[in-house]
């Protein structure tokens, strides 16, 4: 018969590969049919008989065409820093993400691992590059004629107000004061805000043509306690 | 990033033979389907098979069984593809894709090789 | 083999128009229905697999729908970079097969 009249289980002919959502079974040498996402192998085929499939039982899941045993394990629930941005299914893992104010200081291949508040930088320092995702906010000191009076993890260093006379000079971590009751200001008043990073990650997963039959491991590093970087505050 | 890219241009008298190229990169090579495709001027799309890169293993269209070969060198992550005993109506664009074999589609393409048969 | 037609062959439309192509197979390919853009002298972009399932970097004004034998694809709100050739493929049973293509052209 031809390859593509021929039903699962068939020995495909020599030199070809088995057709579409089709696996080569190494022990019964014939092209069986594969399990679809949301299911597993309960029975793998034989020379006379094809792969029966299962449905994945509760917080297990297989996302991909597979010939798998046993469905992959959803990983465990969110943490409180965290948001659940996918649900565990019988197709797709649990995904966490980041809260707002936090960012993801160890990933994984969907999601987050391990998040971590964003910094917040303390008076006399503005945000030099925002918080993201994947990556904490940094601080700096404010140059001369600029100052923040905030303990942020958003506000940036602002201009001086300038004063026609100046009761008590400005400083990093303080605005000028004026004894003219009509100051003049390079920029709007009150506080600069940057955008909260979003902790939203792309849902999107390529299927792959050869699913791996090894379940993922995961794990946690150890993470020591760290001193707070120049500018920000521990907590 | 994940890209194929394929050999220039060729011209050929009907009866002969053209190997075309498709040197993959950003990806495990061995991992993926390599899928080849042909466009006839103002035409549409057809299917001329794929080749498995870990194993050689090809599935052809049955179109093109007999006049076609795909071969594969992993050490340089190149697929091939041959036609023989070419017609003029095998003057077309030759394209090489990645393909997925789950859900039959094709996500990466090259930017493809005309082939041109005239006497 | 399995005949793909997708209809209409060439459409006119303008910026910001909301635009449906659909493609018909001649047997039932469950959700297997992908949808190409191609644009003059380039190789064809994966928009959408299995039906509905946007391919990455595709923005989301592109969708898809239908199941069985009748399928769409819509663009919600045309660009000017959508301008170009769509064609359907099956990828149900083999040999894979394509529409032979609608021209969207710009009105």
């Known amino acids: 018969l031809p390859a593509q009249v021929a039903f699962t289980p068939y020995a495909p002919e020599p030199g070809s590969t088995c057709r579409l959502r089709e696996y080569y079974d190494q022990t019964a040498q014939m092209c069986c049919s594969k399990c679809s996402p949301g299911q597993h192998a309960k029975v793998f085929c034989t020379k006379t008989s094809d792969t029966v499939c299962d449905s994945c039982e509760d917080s297990t899941y297989t996302q991909l065409w597979n010939w798998v045993p046993e469905c992959l394990s959803c990983g465990s629930r969110c943490s409180s820093d965290q948001v659940e941005t996918q649900a565990c299914t019988r197709e797709q893992n649990r995904i966490c993400t980041c809260r707002p104010g936090w960012y993801c200081a160890l990933s994984k291949q969907e999601g987050c691992r391990l998040c971590a508040p964003l910094r917040k930088c303390r008076p006399g320092f503005g945000v030099a590059r925002p918080g993201t995702e994947t990556s904490d906010v940094v601080c700096k000191p404010c140059a001369p004629g600029t100052f923040s009076n905030t303990t942020s993890s958003t506000d940036i260093c602002r201009p001086h107000q300038i004063c026609n006379v100046v009761a008590i000079p400005g400083n990093a971590s303080m605005d000028a004061v004026c004894t003219s009751t009509s100051p003049t200001r390079s920029m709007a008043p009150g506080a600069v805000h940057l955008p909260q990073p979003v902790s939203t990650r792309s849902q999107h997963t390529q299927p792959t043509p050869e699913p791996s039959t090894a379940p993922s491991t995961s794990f946690l590093l150890p993470m020591g306690p760290s001193p707070p970087a120049e500018g920000s505050t521990g907590d | 990033q994940v890209q194929l890219v394929q050999s220039g241009a060729e011209v050929k008298k009907p009866g002969a033979s053209v190997k075309v190229s498709c040197k993959a990169s950003g990806y495990t090579f061995i991992t993926y389907d390599i899928n080849w495709v042909r466009q006839a001027p103002g035409q549409g799309l057809e299917w001329i098979g794929w080749?498995?890169?870990?194993?050689?293993?090809?599935q052809f269209n049955e179109n093109f069984k007999g006049r076609v070969t795909m071969t594969t060198d992993t050490s340089t992550s190149t697929a091939y593809m041959e036609l023989r005993s070419l017609r003029s109506d095998d003057t077309a664009v030759y394209y090489c894709?990645?393909?997925?074999?789950?859900?039959?589609?094709?996500?990466?393409w090259g930017q493809g090789t005309t082939v041109t048969v005239s006497s | 083999d399995i005949q793909m037609t997708q209809s209409p062959s060439s459409l006119s439309a303008s910026v910001g128009d909301r635009v449906t192509i659909t493609c018909r197979a001649s047997?039932?390919?469950?959700?297997?229905l992908n949808w190409y853009q191609q644009k003059p002298g380039k190789a064809p972009k994966l928009l959408i697999y299995f039906k509905s399932k946007l391919h990455s970097g595709v923005p989301s004004r592109f969708s898809g729908s239908g199941s069985g034998t009748d399928f769409t694809l819509t663009i919600s709100s045309l660009q000017p970079e959508d301008f170009a050739t769509y064609y359907c493929?099956?990828?149900?049973?083999?040999?894979?097969?394509f529409g032979g293509g609608t021209k969207l052209e710009i009105k």
């Open positions: 047997q039932d390919i469950s959700n297997y």
């Open positions: 493929q099956q990828g149900n049973t083999l040999p894979l097969t």
């Open positions: 080749i498995y890169p870990r194993d050689g293993n090809t």
């Open positions: 894709a990645r393909g997925d074999r789950d859900y039959g589609y094709f996500d990466v």
